[in-house]
């Protein structure tokens, strides 16, 4: 299906036939098609005419999912590292291809791309030194993490590094910049008058995507960045360090890429697949690469760098972590140590490397040209005990369950595509390249994308981020599933989720968050406008303030971490499999797509209120420059009314009429697409969704009406207020047009 460039023998043969023969055959074929269509119309089964998935099918699918299988698959996927671009990850791709075929998928293909990846130099390790006035190294950071017990002899454990860091050996005074967020640099530069130009900055991991930290440091003039994990963010009180608990030991280090791709995919081939004939940019023109050396360290090494810091005191307690150091900002060391400097030694290389996606197809029986996609990545930094293999194991079991149903004669109404993406850790590369290669098919046929990275980041409650179109699907599904939580035996997942993570707006309902980025749904949602969602089990955000989970992207993210500390019975994994699999099942099998456009109307009003309130912090300027949100509120009102009328027609139309059914479903499918602006957001051409985009200050977070939000951000500091407020007005007009245009796609067709 995807090998669009390969000419088949029959196609070649057809090209040689006389034209009259082809024309005659077409007429004949057309006649048979019409006869078949009419025949099919009249003998349509009654089950086709209802919007309820036959319960026995959904039940059969869910009942087939087994926790023991997920456990077995996770163990299998985590015994050795599966770093993108390595032989081990290629072998795992082939294993998954083979097993998905055995499970019963119609076809399973490997698709390869040649993308820019980054690795440490094997003979020239990366490290950071404290040097004295003579240039002698008096302290060096560690070269690798101490391997966990039982893994000492595993080869090819990549040492901690910041992927895509340039090479360099900068030397200078240290400045502590807290989390290196936009607001942290504002505090440093504007309030404290501290200049980071020519300095090496040290920032703690957490709160925002590491790539944003590096971008902020670059803009501040830093010559290098040291990233570290502070126990305040990665060590939960009362829990032991791995291997005795799930906390980060002092020698543990978080790996990760530091790109600012803004949805571009492979840095050398933005917008196009990195295939054999792709034109590649030179490295100097590559998208999103950092310009200064960056390196990550653990908190024992950080202690040695931070304990000598002098200069300004930290501005307030929000700048202080949990190490026994003063958290002075600097620049430079204190007193006796003032002649000592910090030196980075970074020797990593970036190289074009082959990666492999696995794409499995389960062909739809009724609408084979409508695709529901379940995708998650396969590549890991090291063992991937949580990220990604807790997700990959769930996908594997979902494929097995669908395959079992297919072997028993069942098929989904729509085609389901399953994907094992490569190189997610290097910038969402596998998913983005595949979507670039298949963008024309996806934008015409893509119904929904469900993401399947880590199934767990805790074991407290469910966490869902999705398009508003899927809210009702998620609510209805979770009401049918059993909660795995202690104290909620015999209760629904919806009930435990609502109790533990209540919606801030609507009582009796659970929280569902906006989609941001940092995972493989990005290209499908933010670029192509395909309705998307993700679900996983999470921690208690009220009591656990640490960022992500402590052992994220470290060597200690092992099978044992999951089996001993997070989910010994694999019941949370099973619940996540039921949620993800159940969503895919409903999206692929419901006669009428399980999307509710009225939920989009509700959030559009909420987002319009929010951005209006942000703008109203500048009432004088709004008056001076005649800034009005009236048009946007009017468009939202129109959308609400049209969505309401559409929902009434959806409820009442004749579902046994396949043309009408297809029309209504197409309106639902294309609604998300209608929020796409082909020109993209300012300076971010691959973020094209007008309602949602990753925050410009934190890739992981979603921002609503991002064009207006960014135009308003820090507007009081702009040198040309007239131009700045002009841009606000332009963004309001774009948002207004987009909401109105989307509303009109829901209007009655004739």
């Amino acid at each position: 299906m995807w090998n669009l460039l390969h000419e088949t023998d029959s196609a070649v043969a057809t090209a040689r036939r006389p034209r009259w023969l082809c024309a005659g055959a077409l007429v004949l074929a057309g006649g048979f098609f019409l006869l078949g269509f009419l025949f099919g119309w009249f003998i349509k089964s009654s089950s086709e005419a209802t919007n309820i998935t036959p319960k026995h099918n959904m039940k059969a699918f869910l009942d087939e999912l087994k926790a023991e299988n997920i456990k077995k698959f996770l163990h299998n996927f985590t015994q050795i590292p599966h770093l993108a671009g390595t032989e081990q990850n290629f072998q795992l791709a082939k294993q998954i291809q083979s097993q998905w075929k055995e499970f019963g998928l119609d076809s399973v293909e490997l698709t390869h791309y040649d993308v820019l990846l980054s690795y440490p130099n094997k003979t020239h390790p990366n490290y950071i030194s404290i040097i004295n006035e003579d240039g002698n190294e008096i302290f060096n950071t560690s070269l690798f993490e101490p391997p966990p017990a039982g893994y000492e002899n595993v080869s090819d454990i990549v040492p901690p590094f910041s992927a895509f860091s340039p090479q360099g050996m900068p030397e200078g005074d240290l400045v502590y910049v807290n989390y290196a967020r936009t607001e942290d640099f504002f505090k440093l530069e504007r309030d404290m008058k501290i200049n980071c130009s020519g300095k090496i900055v040290i920032a703690r991991y957490g709160k925002v995507f590491r790539g944003n930290k590096v971008k902020n440091a670059q803009l501040a003039g830093a010559t290098g960045v040291i990233l570290y994990s502070d126990p305040a963010d990665y060590f939960a009180p009362g829990v032991k360090s791995y291997p005795d608990g799930w906390n980060l030991p002092g020698g543990g280090v978080q790996r990760g890429n530091i790109l600012n791709l803004n949805g571009a995919g492979d840095p050398l081939t933005p917008g196009y697949p990195a295939n054999e004939y792709a034109y590649r940019r030179g490295i100097a023109e590559a998208v999103g690469l950092p310009s200064i050396p960056v390196h990550p360290i653990g908190y024992y090494d950080a202690q040695k760098l931070l304990e000598k810091m002098g200069g300004s005191a930290s501005p307030d307690s929000s700048w202080r972590g949990s190490l026994k150091v003063p958290y002075n900002v600097g620049p430079g060391f204190t007193g006796n140590f003032s002649t000592q400097k910090v030196k980075m030694h970074i020797h990593s290389t970036s190289e074009v490397t082959r990666i492999y996606n696995v794409i499995g197809t389960l062909r739809g029986a009724v609408e084979p040209d409508r695709y529901v996609i379940l995708g998650g990545h396969r590549d890991s930094w090291v063992f991937g005990g949580i990220d990604p293999q807790s997700g990959a194991a769930v996908v594997h079991e979902i494929v097995r369950s669908f395959g079992t149903l297919k072997k028993e004669g069942w098929r989904p109404r729509r085609t389901i595509l399953f994907a094992s993406w490569d190189a997610e850790e290097f910038g969402l590369l596998g998913s983005t390249e595949w979507a670039e290669e298949n963008s024309r098919l996806l934008q015409e046929r893509g119904v929904a994308y469900i993401n399947a990275d880590s199934s767990i980041e805790g074991n407290y409650t469910l966490r869902v981020d999705c398009t508003p179109l899927m809210y009702s699907l998620v609510y209805n599904l979770t009401k049918e599933l059993e909660s795995p939580d202690e104290g909620f035996e015999g209760k629904s997942l919806y009930e435990s989720w609502t109790k533990k993570s209540p919606s801030p707006e609507f009582s009796g309902m659970p929280r569902i968050s906006k989609l941001g980025s940092g995972n493989d749904f990005e290209v499908f949602f933010q670029r192509l406008g395909i309705a998307s969602g993700r679900a996983r089990y999470t921690k208690n955000w009220e009591t656990n303030k640490f960022s992500s989970y402590p052992l994220y992207h470290s060597v200690y993210e092992t099978y044992e971490l999951v089996e001993k500390f997070y989910d010994p019975m694999f019941k949370y994994h099973l619940t996540v499999a039921q949620v993800r699999g159940g969503m895919v099942f409903e999206l692929a099998n419901s006669v009428v797509l399980p999307f509710d456009c009225r939920d989009y109307a509700v959030v559009l009003r909420k987002y319009a209120d929010k951005i209006y309130n942000i703008s109203m912090k500048h009432p004088q300027e709004m008056k001076t420059y005649s800034v009005s949100f009236d048009s946007l509120f009017s468009a939202v009102k129109n959308f609400t009314e049209i969505a309401s009328k559409f929902s009434e027609r959806l409820r009442d139309f004749d579902k046994s009429n396949p043309i009408l059914l297809r029309m209504m479903n197409d309106q639902l499918m294309f609604l998300e697409r209608a929020f796409i602006d082909p020109l993209g957001l300012p300076d971010r051409p691959f973020y094209r969704h007008v309602i949602y985009a990753p925050s410009s200050h934190n890739k992981y977070a979603g921002e609503s009406f991002p064009g207006i939000y960014d135009a308003l951000f820090d507007i009081e500091s702009k040198v040309d207020p007239s131009q700045a407020w002009g841009e606000v007005k332009r963004q309001i007009s774009i948002a207004t047009f987009t909401v109105q245009a989307a509303a009109e796609t829901l209007s009655e067709v004739a």
Partner: nanobody, 125 residues
Framework: QVQLVESGGGLVQPGGSLRLSCAAS????????MHWVRQAPGKGLEWVAF????????YYVDSVKGRFTISRDNSKNTLYLQMNSLRAEDTAVYYC??????????????????WGQGTTVTVSS
């Protein structure tokens, strides 16, 4: 159980060389910093050298700098001390010791929790 066994000591003339070895078992050797400590006859313990778990940091007492070299082979679970230009004042029982802070690559500024039985080095003409 955790065990450290030193070997390689002996009698050597001033200016000579010796290589001490310390075979470790019962713990994840590659996760711990390791020390050499010595005790001269009738004297107290003196710390000699330290090496971090990954070899990124090595530290020596001033009196042996430039003469002694600490090294380790994590694949063999073994710590070494190469001693050159030996002097009479280097005569002592040499112990290897395991650092008690797991995962530490920093300075040797903490206690040691496991010791070997020692190997005797005598420097005499």
């Amino acid at each position: 159980q955790v065990q450290l066994v030193e070997s390689g000591g002996g009698l050597v003339q001033p200016g000579g060389s010796l290589r001490l070895s310390c075979a470790a078992s019962g713990f994840t050797f590659s996760s711990y910093g390791m020390h050499w400590v010595r005790q001269a006859p009738g004297k107290g313990l003196e710390w000699v050298a330290f090496m971090s778990y990954d070899g990124s940091n090595k530290y020596y007492v001033d009196s042996v700098k430039g003469r002694f070299t600490i090294s380790r082979d994590n694949s063999k679970n073994t710590l070494y001390l190469q001693m050159n230009s030996l002097r009479a004042e280097d005569t002592a029982v040499y112990y290897c010791a395991k650092g008690d802070y797991d995962f530490w690559s920093g300075y040797p500024d903490y206690d040691m929790d496991v010791w070997g039985q020692g190997t005797t080095v005598t420097v005499s003409s």
